[in-house]
Interface confidence: low
């Protein structure tokens, strides 16, 4: 069978599974005269043999873990033993079988985790090795937790990254672990080869002891601070502490106040920096943040609450320079004249703002002093001794002392004595007829003028007329403004008229005085008038129930998921057809009849959230009027973007030869959402073969350092693969390549002879 198992002498490669006893020859080389015999050299390990006639075979099972490639040479010799052909390279690749079990590097691991640590952030790695080929399932390891002790309510507090062996807290673990309740846990971890997918996989187990330590990064109790403190500032009011030394603290004022009177020092002590004023602001809420030296947040911010305690630092204030009341001549003892309402800026419902009223002077004192009483706490003025006579004293002036527990203020009240109110208002017309208006008549339009007259003393509360609509306008669409000089009433539109709900309204007005009528006089039919309002139909556009509709969904919802709905009604009762406008990404469709909105394509928060489209409601039939509203779809992040390099790192170089191991720093990012803390990536080399030459070490959640392990590099470009894991749910991993060139340098830059300028690196390390 020329070609497959026999043929002339030429370079060849053969693949043979390890662990198999020899069952056939490898190859039969044919000699070309003057060659008569063959000779085998190289990595034969006394396994590979060639017979003089050129038959290449092996005499016992191979072991890939001893040698994965045998580099052999075959030469053809003449009758004198002189090489006449070759030697040519013959490569034997030993193919892997699963003949090695994974083994943990340690039979017991110990670690600690702080309570409330971020879920998914590794705090310990277990590590197993398997001598089989990592490029095949035989050497691909799969870690899992066999048991967690203790297990409370069947809830797992710990999780393991199946591929990396990174142990972290679950969301429940982050919330519930408490060293006061349970300071230690034990995990049994298994590792399987074959990627954990085969019944024939080998496995090993290890034990992990975990100590839970207290998290001291906790929000302090709310602080109470007395306003207008005269103590020297700054004054320490509370403190926060990060779990380890060296954190950098700062305060974040979410309210963006023009004056933010708090500061934090490098020990985490929080100070008020100047006296506070409760009347300016009675409470503050701000955040304390701890960052590492690169300015990356170490954890979530803590909410700090400061309540400002009131002191009595505000006197009572009068409602106006002079408060004017009217009293009729014949009013009876005890009648209310009016209420003086003073104010106090101190805290409501406390002694600091509780007011007392006292009359300190009445002028004139005619016919006697003490004609008026004021209720001590309510401030209501009453007639105390007798009815008043306008011709004797038409006006009284009272000085009233208003006091809180520390301050006194004088307020001034003028009381005008007016004629008795013995005349009622009389409408000039009892019926103002019919008025026809279109339903889209502007708000604020005056639609009717009405007039009543009152024969009592002009420009007093006895003759002043107030008009009320007492019937026919339960929706409050109309109002009446009165001209104080003429008592003319102007009927105005306060709310839109509506043909659909009120086509005809029978309106009844009542005219009355602010002052009470004297005993025995009552309002009668003369004080009432009516008119009929007829509203005509105008075809109106549909009306949406909201100006903006908002919905929130996860960005990974299945196509066809209902993501929201809108509703509109047509005032005329016509059917409505819904449509979308501005769906630039083609993500959505709307049910024309129901207004339900569905996804029709994969959504992507990173393309922009919220996604804003317009919804259009159009009348079906009629004049097809339409109106527009907004639909805002807020997309909640899922971890769907693997980490990547934050910028282009082409052009990295080291000057060759290296005088000492070197390093460079690179930054990773991803497009997912990272609230407060920013990303927390973990970094590792992308393949095992890189580990002899390179080392990657994490600096912080986004930066890592790539270092050379030695100085013996060739003068060429190396492509270093880096594995970056985002620790998300699910964790996503990106493999990125950093091209690093080792080159001869002139004055710190890569030197290339003329004609070799392509791809010249530009950044030296």
């Amino acid at each position: 069978q020329e070609g497959k198992f026999s043929g002339p002498l030429k370079p060849m490669t053969f693949s043979i599974y390890e662990g198999q006893e020899p069952s056939q020859i490898i190859f039969q080389f044919k000699a070309n005269p003057p060659a008569v015999t063959f000779e085998l050299t190289g990595e034969t390990d006394n396994i590979f043999v060639i017979e003089r006639e050129g038959l290449l075979y092996y005499n016992r099972a191979l072991d890939r873990e001893t040698r994965s490639t045998h580099n052999l040479q075959v030469a053809a010799l003449d009758a004198n033993g002189i090489i006449v052909e070759g030697p040519v390279p013959i490569t034997i690749k030993v193919k892997d079988i699963n003949d090695n079990r994974p083994t943990f590097l340690q039979s017991k691991y110990e670690g600690s985790v702080r309570q409330n640590s971020r879920p998914g952030k590794p705090f310990l790695y277990v590590n197993a090795t398997d001598l089989d080929d990592p490029a095949t399932p035989n050497g691909q390891l799969y870690y899992q937790i066999v048991i967690q002790l203790p297990m409370i309510n069947n809830v797992m507090y710990f999780q393991i990254n199946n591929k990396t062996g990174a142990i972290s807290l679950t969301r429940e673990g982050s919330q519930e672990l408490n060293p006061a309740k349970n300071p230690s846990y034990n995990l049994v971890i298994s590792v399987k080869d074959m990627g954990g997918q085969s019944e024939n996989s080998f496995s090993d187990t290890t034990s992990v002891d975990i100590i839970v330590t207290e998290n001291i990064w906790k929000a302090p109790k709310p602080v109470e601070m007395v306003e207008n403190s005269t103590d020297p500032h700054p004054i320490k009011i509370t403190q926060v502490r990060w779990n380890d030394p060296g954190a950098q603290y700062s305060l974040v004022d979410k309210e963006k106040l023009p004056r933010f009177p708090f500061s934090i020092d490098q020990e985490g002590d929080i100070y008020v920096t100047q006296p506070l004023d409760r009347e300016e602001k009675d409470a503050y809420v701000f955040y304390a943040v701890a960052k590492d030296e690169y300015g990356k947040p170490l954890s979530y911010p803590l909410e700090i609450h400061v309540k400002v305690k009131d002191i009595n630092d505000n006197p009572p204030t009068c409602p106006s320079p002079v408060t004017v009341f009217e009293v009729q001549e014949n009013e009876r003892l005890g009648n209310s004249i009016g209420t003086l309402t003073a104010h106090d800026r101190d805290e409501e419902n406390t002694a600091n703002s509780f007011l007392n009223y006292r009359i300190v002077e009445q002028t004139p004192k005619l016919p006697m002093d003490g004609l008026f009483l004021i209720q001590t706490y309510a401030g209501m003025l009453q007639l105390a001794k007798q009815s008043l006579k306008k011709q004797d004293t038409p006006q009284y002036n009272l000085t009233i002392e208003v006091s809180d527990k520390d301050f006194k203020t004088l307020c001034f009240v003028q009381i005008n004595v007016i004629d008795i109110n013995d005349q009622i208002p009389i409408f000039e017309k009892s019926d103002y007829g019919n008025l026809t208006l279109a339903e889209d008549t502007n708000i604020g339009s005056t639609i009717l003028t009405i007039q009543a007259t009152d024969a009592d003393e002009p420009f007093t509360g006895s003759s002043k007329i107030l008009y009320h609509i007492i019937k026919g306008d339960s929706e409050g669409r109309l109002g009446v403004d009165t001209d104080p000089h003429t008592n003319t009433g102007y009927v105005i539109i306060k709310k839109p008229l509506d043909f659909e709900t009120a086509a005809v309204s029978n309106i009844v007005f009542k005219a009355e005085n602010p002052e009470p009528l004297v005993f025995g006089v009552k309002y009668n039919a003369s004080s009432f008038a009516k008119f009929t309002l007829i509203v005509t139909d105008v075809n109106e556009a549909p009306q949406f129930s909201q100006h903006v509709f908002q919905a929130k969904v996860s960005e990974d919802v299945a196509i066809g998921t209902k993501v929201g709905n809108v509703t509109a009604k047509d005032p005329e009762g016509l059917d409505i057809s819904y449509s979308l406008r501005g769906d630039t990404r083609g993500w959505l469709k709307i049910d024309h009849v129901t207004g339900e909105i569905f996804s029709v394509a994969p959504l992507d928060r990173e393309a922009g959230s919220p996604y804003r489209v317009q919804v259009v409601a159009t009348e079906v039939g009629g004049s097809s009027l339409s109106s527009v509203s907004e639909f805002h779809l807020i997309l909640m992040d899922v971890n769907d973007n693997p980490p990547r390099l934050a910028k282009d790192y082409t052009g990295l170089f080291f000057c060759h030869p290296l005088s000492a191991p070197g390093s460079l720093i690179f930054e990773a990012t991803d497009d997912d959402q990272h609230l407060f803390r920013g990303p927390h990536f973990t970094f590792s080399l992308g393949s095992g073969s890189l580990q002899n030459d390179w080392e990657v070490s994490k600096i912080n959640g986004t930066h890592a350092r790539l270092s050379t392990r030695h100085t013996e590099f060739e003068e060429r470009e190396y492509v270093v693969l880096i594995r970056i894991n985002d620790g998300g749910r699910p964790p996503l991993e990106g493999i990125v390549s950093l091209p690093v060139t080792f080159c001869s340098c002139v004055e710190g830059s890569c030197f290339r002879p003329a004609g070799h300028q392509t791809g010249i690196p530009t950044v030296g390390m």
């Epitope: 030394p245 060296g246 950098q248 490098q266 600096i699």
Partner: antibody, heavy 121, light 111 residues
Framework: EVQLLETGGGVVKPGGSLKLSCAAS????????MSWVRQTPEKRLEWVAA????????YYTDNVKGRFTISRDNAKNSLYLQMSSLRSEDTALYYC??????????????WGAGTTVTVSS | DVVLTQTPLSLPVTLGDQASISCRSS???????????LHWYLLKPGQSPKLLIY???NRFSGVPDRFSGSGSGTDFTLKITRVEAEDLGVYFC????????FGAGTKLELK
């Protein structure tokens, strides 16, 4: 007790070199940025150089850039100042100082006793 | 670089007196982050400098409350309410809003 102890000072000719060391004890050295500060014969204080916690970032005052190198060995709790091309104006008492990093502003809360460098022909 | 000018250069006092030292900066020390990085140190003969006040007015731990700092922008003051013997020495102001610099020092001595 928190302590910083400087060594390595001496008399050197202009153009010569000298390496100062500072041994830290009583605190977690790797948690703190460190600086060298000198006191001139006229009793003025001058900040010379600084280094961050892991040694990855260094800072220098303009008139020592290119001549002085600050470094640290966290495993040995030690800070160093390699001085070369020394000039007479470098004559001073050199203090090692622990800095609290206040964003981008430093103050020094622990100082050593100092070591004297004299540059003279 | 930012120049810090201290006045007076020498301040003779009687024990129990109040002392006041001024430090004026050639440019504002208010950082864009809202902090003002102006600090005060005391250097006593034969000793190393000691931190007294950081960020204008914050007393460092263990510093007696007779020491207080104040000021803003370019003008700053260190006050000692009742001078004691242990307070004698040279006081330096320092800024680290810009490249770190020190003032020339003020010598507090007995009359």
């Amino acid at each position: 007790e928190v302590q910083l102890l400087e060594t390595g000072g001496g008399v050197v000719k202009p153009g010569g070199s000298l390496k100062l060391s500072c041994a830290a004890s009583g605190f977690t050295f790797s948690n703190y940025g460190m600086s060298w500060v000198r006191q001139t014969p006229e009793k003025r204080l001058e900040w010379v150089a600084a280094i961050n916690r892991d040694g990855g970032t260094t800072y220098y005052t303009d008139n020592v850039k290119g001549r002085f190198t600050i470094s640290r060995d966290n495993a040995k709790n030690s800070l160093y100042l390699q001085m070369s091309s020394l000039r007479s104006e470098d004559t001073a008492l050199y203090y090692c100082a622990r800095q609290f990093l206040l964003w981008d502003g430093w103050y020094f809360d622990v100082w050593g006793a100092g070591t004297t460098v004299t540059v003279s022909s | 670089d930012v120049v810090l000018t201290q006045t007076p250069l020498s301040l003779p006092v009687t024990l129990g007196d109040q002392a006041s030292i001024s430090c004026r900066s050639s440019q504002s020390l208010l950082h864009s982050n809202g902090n003002t990085y102006l600090h005060w140190y005391l250097l006593k003969p034969g000793q190393s400098p000691k931190l007294l006040i950081y960020k204008v007015s914050n007393r460092f731990s263990g510093v007696p409350d007779r020491f207080s700092g104040s000021g803003s922008g370019t003008d700053f003051t260190l006050k000692i309410t009742r001078v004691e013997a242990e307070d004698l020495g040279v006081y330096f102001c320092s800024q680290s809003t810009h490249v770190l610099t020190f003032g020339a020092g003020t010598k507090l001595e007995l009359k």
